[in-house]
């Protein structure tokens, strides 16, 4: 698995999105967790619904919510009150029984409020940004800029 | 094992440039903010500048803002300092420092320093 | 950019003591602080982030706490590898450090 990289502002609400297969993982619960380090196991922070045919209701734990769209194939994770300490790497998984699969392995990078911090260089609309492959950062949005291109406008 | 090594100090004249490179292995580099960090002779630590996983994000102590420039190459594993129309109190270790995971805001690894003295 | 001041600026102590070093903003800090130990001739180390938390590798003698503006470091028992001069961090606000306490033999 690649490892995208979804940008967020401190005090600010970040959106996750995992694309998958709608057919492949129907009837099949949803989890975000949270890795512990680059290679420690996964602590579930949220799952969907118990009742799959529910899924699309949303649900809490903390500041941390998850929805799926099991017909289109997204499942939606919402950070609210970004903090510096969520930062980190994260798994969306799909259950089936004791087991679960990676839909996708996202790192959400905190970065300062701009209004805090007004000598922010090249500061843009925070989302899905960048991926990471097997160490190696792809061509994408955040290397444009670094580059010195026109941002793109946040995937949604 | 985690290693943050600092290059590129030295002596240099008030007004000239420096370019400090800080090289690290034992950790998958792109998934870290990154910033260094000074300290000049006996004195205290001092945040210099800050910089996102992908580059895109830069951030920098007023006293350094316009004259000092922070970049990764992540291709490398590598941090880079530019500092450009140095000041006598621009002399201090430079330390790379790693962040966590996604981000810059503390610093779980300290690299050894590197010197640079700026004097006529 | 918050101001942090640290007391006292050397304390002197002995092994075994209980030492508490003390560190104070000139604004809230919301609990984004961190504690450094730097040795002579040695890079900084991360102790403590986010108040209380425990870097991985450090010892349990070492704790943190505070809230607001007012934050401490406290050691349990004193080992003669604890001198050393320690900084608080904060990140709530910008980035700044105290002015450290050095902390040597009685």
């Known amino acids: 698995h690649n490892t995208t990289v979804f940008q967020g502002v401190a005090g600010q609400s970040l959106q996750v999105s995992c694309p998958y297969d709608s057919m492949k993982h129907w009837g099949r619960r949803k989890a975000w967790c949270r890795q512990l380090g680059e290679k420690g196991p996964c602590q579930r922070v949220v799952s969907t619904h118990n009742l799959w045919l529910l899924s699309f209701l949303r649900r809490w734990n903390g500041s941390t919510a998850i929805t799926d769209d099991t017909l289109g194939g997204t499942l939606t994770i919402t950070l609210r009150n970004l903090q510096p300490h969520d930062a980190g790497l994260y798994q969306c998984q799909s259950l089936h029984g004791s087991e679960a699969d990676t839909l996708r392995k996202v790192l959400v990078e905190v970065l300062a409020d701009p209004l805090d911090h007004r000598d922010a260089g090249d500061l843009w609309f925070p989302g899905e940004s960048e991926s990471f492959e097997d160490a190696h950062v792809e061509h994408s949005i955040s290397r444009s800029l670094l580059e010195g291109e026109i941002p793109f406008p946040p995937t949604s | 094992e985690v290693q943050l090594v600092e290059s590129g100090g030295g002596l240099v004249q008030p007004g000239k440039s420096l370019k400090l490179s800080c090289a690290a292995s034992?950790?998958?580099?792109?998934?870290?903010?990154m910033a260094w960090v000074r300290q000049a002779p006996t004195k205290g630590l001092e945040w210099v500048a800050s910089?996102?996983?992908?580059?895109?994000?830069?951030y920098y102590r007023d006293s350094v803002k316009g004259r000092f420039t922070i970049s990764r190459g992540n291709a490398k594993n590598t941090l880079y300092l530019q500092m450009d129309s140095l000041r006598s109190e621009d002399t201090a270790t430079y330390y790379c420092a790693r962040g966590d995971i996604g981000t810059s805001y503390w610093f779980t690894y300290w690299g050894q320093g590197t010197l640079v003295t700026v004097s006529s | 950019d918050i101001q942090l001041t640290q007391s006292p600026s050397l304390l002197s102590a002995s092994v075994g003591d209980r030492v508490t070093l003390s560190c104070k903003g000139s604004q809230t800090i919301n609990n984004y602080l961190a504690w450094y130990q730097q040795k002579l001739g040695e890079a900084p180390k991360l102790l403590i982030y986010k108040t209380n938390s425990l870097q991985t590798g450090i010892p349990s003698r070492f704790s943190g706490s505070g809230s607001g503006t007012d934050y401490t470091l406290t050691i349990s028992s004193l080992h003669s590898e604890d001198l050393a001069t320690y900084y608080c961090y904060q990140y709530n606000n910008g980035w700044t450090f105290g002015g450290g306490t050095k902390l040597e033999l009685k």
């Open positions: 910089i996102s996983t992908g580059g895109g994000n830069t």
């Open positions: 034992g950790f998958t580099f792109s998934y870290y903010g």
